[in-house]
């Protein structure tokens, strides 16, 4: 998005770890009703891979049909598929269904990347590896797409998890974990483990594969490991964080923290992608390049564009920095890392003319809209989306790629000032994400 | 309130090219498709080609291959006919149009052409 | 290509009469989706065309429901129950399932 204006940014905000321990919550703290630490009914109920999005099984209508819906924590309609597509195995029949309300309303809507358009309805739905629960739910019908539905991702709809803020036609129309909440007692939180395969994965592998788990209504501690720690939703419409430092093996950007988060920055399970703003992303891909300056790569590569492989098992992962984003704290002038590898940011793809090879492209792209914080980020951790006291928890994901030396870490707390200034104040307009 | 306004009026020599251009307000045209038709007086409408401003991918009439090129500039929120070795036969009114994927929902008010020496 | 041909070309009418305008197709317009992409528009004398109809029978936003459509397959048209001095103009169909999207010649809709 353009804006005309920027707001005078700030310099000078201290992030450096100061080694003080400040009072923070953790996991051993009373849980919460519905809270509880295991939902086995749900773990490994999402399958998929970062590049085409994770969905998890869902049914519509009476008598119910099952189709696979992407989850999407970046966009707030619930969307399937409801026509013939040369990309989809299946479509939502409304006609097959005694439970369906036509409500008689067209909706369009057009993503970062990919559009569709369809009616709204509703219906009856249900997610078999979920709460055992069934819901009311807005539902668009979508009967036109272009770029959207993806050739073997094997999903055939979208869950959009964030708030109406953001919903398309406009923030009357409920979003499906609204609904939810609203007509059930399930607690008012989704947590998501995305698991990222470390390794290119073919169709059959995919369906085989288990890609993570969306435990709706509460966290599963089999999920992480050490602590969760939580950062504040700014505002409720994305889910908005505040980034207030960024360091690449330890070394701080030092650009103002505003920057960081111009114009937003979000967590988005429907994004690829760790995506910067231009400028912060320029000045990360130096130092990424300096850190790793042993091997040289082609410009194409750091432009997302060009593959890069070794030799089967010979991927030098020592030689790329680490990354890590701090974020406010829960209390005042604190505020926690959380940190990803190069396992997380190289994203393996296959590369047919070499299938011997371990090839890669790199996942941190340059935004207009801001930073999103998509799946490579998320494959590091497990992420709470703890809507019912309006922040996002982070925990060391216990499906995380790793290697012997290093690891996926959230850490903290670290003392930092002025954190609010980090926050860049939007001109009101509404956009959507989509793996992007 | 979503307008798409028009470059004005051209009057311009055989043989020459022309860019006639289009600016959105009130929507962001990377979020839409950009449609270009042709009117002719007594001739009716005649579909030119879109753009997909998001990843600048267009599809044309054949027939216009090579004649017309739509390009986009989602900075200036704006979309480009242009039109190369022009004759008499490109004399004609020439429209924008926004479209969903399915609805050509807002029209230009049009720039009129005239190719004359 | 589609070729959309429109009849009458010309319709005289008196105020507050029906009037209906037939639109056929070389081809019929089914998309493999299922739906059929026909659309009509109205262009008033000096301005640019307005939608009236899309996918058939889809009246836009504000248009007033004394419009109807119907068809299937290549055969479609376009009713006004009651027309009125702001219906006067020029009325296309046109179609957007195949490529390139074509239009009818028109049919003019004009006082007796």
């Known amino acids: 998005t353009q804006h005309g204006i920027r707001l005078p940014l700030r310099s000078g905000l201290g992030g450096a770890p100061l080694g003080l321990r400040l009072p923070r919550e953790t996991d051993e703290e009373p849980e919460e009703p519905g809270r509880r630490g295991s939902f086995v009914e749900m773990v490994d109920n999402l399958r998929g891979k970062s590049g085409q999005g994770y969905y998890v099984e869902m049914t519509v209508g009476s008598p119910p049909q099952t189709l696979n819906i992407l989850v999407d924590t970046g966009s707030s309609n619930f969307a399937v598929g409801a026509a013939p597509h040369p990309f989809l195995h299946r479509y939502y029949q409304r006609q097959l269904s005694s439970t369906y309300r036509d409500l008689r309303k067209g909706v369009y809507v057009p993503y970062t990347q990919g559009k569709w358009e369809g009616e709204l309805g509703t219906d009856l739905v249900s997610i078999p590896h979920g709460p055992n629960v069934t819901v009311r739910a807005n539902i668009a019908a979508i009967t036109e797409s272009d770029k959207f539905f993806i050739n073997g991702s094997n999903w055939e709809g979208i869950l959009g998890l964030a708030y109406a803020e953001i919903a398309r036609p406009d923030d009357s129309l409920e979003p499906f974990f609204d609904s939810l909440v609203k007509q059930t007692h399930v607690p008012n939180l989704f947590s998501l483990q995305l698991c990222g395969a470390g390794f290119p994965l073919n169709q059959s592998e995919v369906l085989a594969s288990v890609g993570g788990s969306m435990i709706i209504g509460g966290i599963d501690h089999s999920l992480y490991t050490g602590s969760l720690w939580y950062t504040p939703i700014r505002r409720e419409w994305y889910y908005e964080v505040i980034i207030v430092r960024v360091e690449i093996n330890g070394q701080d950007l030092k650009m103002d923290c505003k920057e960081y988060n111009y114009d937003k920055s979000i967590v988005d399970s429907g994004t690829t992608n760790l995506r910067l703003p231009k400028k912060v992303f320029e000045a990360a891909v130096k130092s990424i390049k300096a850190a790793s300056s042993t091997e040289k790569f082609p410009d194409g590569f750091w432009l997302g564009e060009q593959l890069v492989c070794w030799q089967a098992g010979t991927t030098p992962w020592n030689i790329f920095p680490v990354i890590s984003l701090y974020l406010m704290g829960e209390v005042t002038n604190q505020s926690f890392r959380i940190t990803i590898l190069p396992q997380q940011y190289l994203r393996p793809v296959e590369d047919v003319a070499t299938s011997q090879d371990d090839c890669y492209k790199f996942a941190i792209s340059q935004s207009s809209t801001g930073t999103v914080m998509g799946a490579v980020i998320m494959e590091g951790f497990y992420v709470v989306f703890d809507r019912a006291r309006k922040r996002i928890g982070f925990a060391v994901s216990a499906c995380h790629v790793h290697d012997e030396f290093r690891t996926a870490a959230v850490e903290g707390p670290f003392v930092t000032l002025d954190m609010e200034d980090c926050g860049y104040n939007i001109p009101q307009t509404d956009e959507s994400t989509l793996m992007t | 309130e979503v307008q798409l306004q028009q470059s004005g009026a051209e009057l311009v020599k055989p043989g020459a090219s022309v860019k006639l251009s289009c600016t959105a307000s009130?929507?962001?045209?990377?979020?839409?498709?950009i449609h270009w038709m042709k009117q002719r007086t007594e001739q009716g409408l005649e579909w030119i080609g879109k753009?997909?401003?998001?990843?600048?991918?267009?599809t044309y009439d054949p027939k216009f291959q090579g004649k017309a090129t739509i390009t986009a500039d989602t900075s200036s929120n704006t979309a480009y006919l242009q039109l190369s070795s022009l004759t008499s036969e490109d004399t004609a009114v020439y429209y924008c149009?926004?479209?969903?994927?399915?609805?050509?929902?807002?029209w230009g008010q049009g720039t009129t052409l005239t190719v004359s020496s | 290509d589609i070729q959309m041909t429109q009849s009458p070309l010309s319709l005289p009418v008196s105020l507050g009469d029906q009037a209906s305008i037939s639109c056929r197709s070389s081809?019929?317009?089914?998309?493999?989706?299922?739906?059929?992409?026909l659309h009509w528009f109205l262009q008033k004398p000096g301005q640019s065309p307005k939608l009236l109809i899309s996918?058939?029978?889809n009246r836009f936003s504000g248009v007033p429901d004394r419009f109807s459509s119907s068809g299937s397959g290549t055969d479609f048209t376009l009713k006004i129950t009651r027309v009125e001095a702001e219906d006067l103009g020029i009325y296309f169909c046109?179609?957007?399932?195949?490529?390139?999207?074509?239009f009818g010649g028109g049919t003019k809709l004009e006082l007796k």
């Open positions: 081809q019929s317009l089914v998309h493999s989706n299922g739906y059929t992409y």
């Open positions: 009130g929507f962001k045209i990377k979020d839409y498709y």
């Open positions: 996918k058939v029978s």
């Open positions: 753009i997909d401003p998001a990843d600048g991918e267009t």
């Open positions: 046109s179609q957007s399932t195949h490529v390139p999207y074509t």
């Open positions: 149009v926004r479209s969903t994927l399915v609805l050509f929902d807002y």
